[in-house]
């Protein structure tokens, strides 16, 4: 796995427990690119940051997974963290 996966994991590990919960809830309704499916709710809500990173990369691949993660962070008001994530993936 590469740089984008590490950047996603780094971002998710920096969320508080409350923020990680909110991230998952927003992920359930975030607008997706055509052709991509949603991670099932049941599986999602019990995941920790590491499991969630793996699931995001498996479902959306690294590049889109990082973009989607950044957008959910922006939806949460965490624009700075989103920018850091995207900067790390484009290095």
């Amino acid at each position: 796995m590469g740089r984008a996966r590490d950047a996603i994991l780094d971002a998710l590990e920096n969320l508080t427990a409350e923020e990680l919960k909110k991230f998952k809830l927003k992920l359930l309704s975030v607008p997706l690119r055509e052709g991509y499916g949603r991670i099932p709710r049941g599986a999602l809500l019990s995941m920790d940051a590491l499991d969630l990173t793996d699931k995001l990369v498996a479902a959306y691949l690294e590049t889109y997974g990082a973009e989607l993660t950044a957008n959910v962070l922006r939806d949460m008001g965490l624009q700075e963290m989103a920018g850091q994530l995207q900067a790390a993936t484009h290095q």
Partner: antibody
Amino acid sequence: QVQLQQPGTELVKPGASVKLSCRASGWTHWVKQRPGQGLEWIGNINLSNGRTNYNEKFRAMATLTVDKSSSTAYTQLSSLTSEDSAVYYCANSMVPHFFPMDYWGQGTSVTVSS
Amino acid sequence: NIVMTQYPKSMSLSIGERVTLRCKASENVGSYVSWYQQKPEQSPKLLIYGASNRYTGVPDRFTGSGSATDFILTITSVQAEDLADYHCGQSYNYPLTFGAGTKLELK
């Protein structure tokens, strides 16, 4: 419809400070509008965890705080000059995606004059 | 900081006209653009978010479009109550920034 409660007017002397309040929830933004001008974002604060973000332009003069017990956000504006005479709005971001400001207070008109 | 440029600064129009307001971002902001309507002596009101999503209760004559750097607010048939200032704003990066506004006036 959520109503964000803000006091109507404040008259302060140059060099003094003023503390503006807003009954709100979630992310609360503070926005400045001088007469006949556009909107300027001062910063925001998350009422649940106290996380703040500032526009560097206002970092030296604005301090954002929250009182969780009363769900009230505050901005203290210090060392005021005539350039700070403006309407100050608080606004909430409650829409789940794209972080728009969907609820706005009626604004507090601050006049800086001796 | 991301600069949001709105044009035209003002427009004089007749009731029933179709109006196109434009907003240009100085860098890519994805779909993180909102449009706000502000009437004299009132606070701004959200019309469109995510570039194209109409906010609750907003009449369907208001339509938002665009992505990346170029955004449009269209009012298909302007009504008297639409005469106001319109601000675009981006929420892609901090600091959040707004355009200088476009004023719609009666001809």
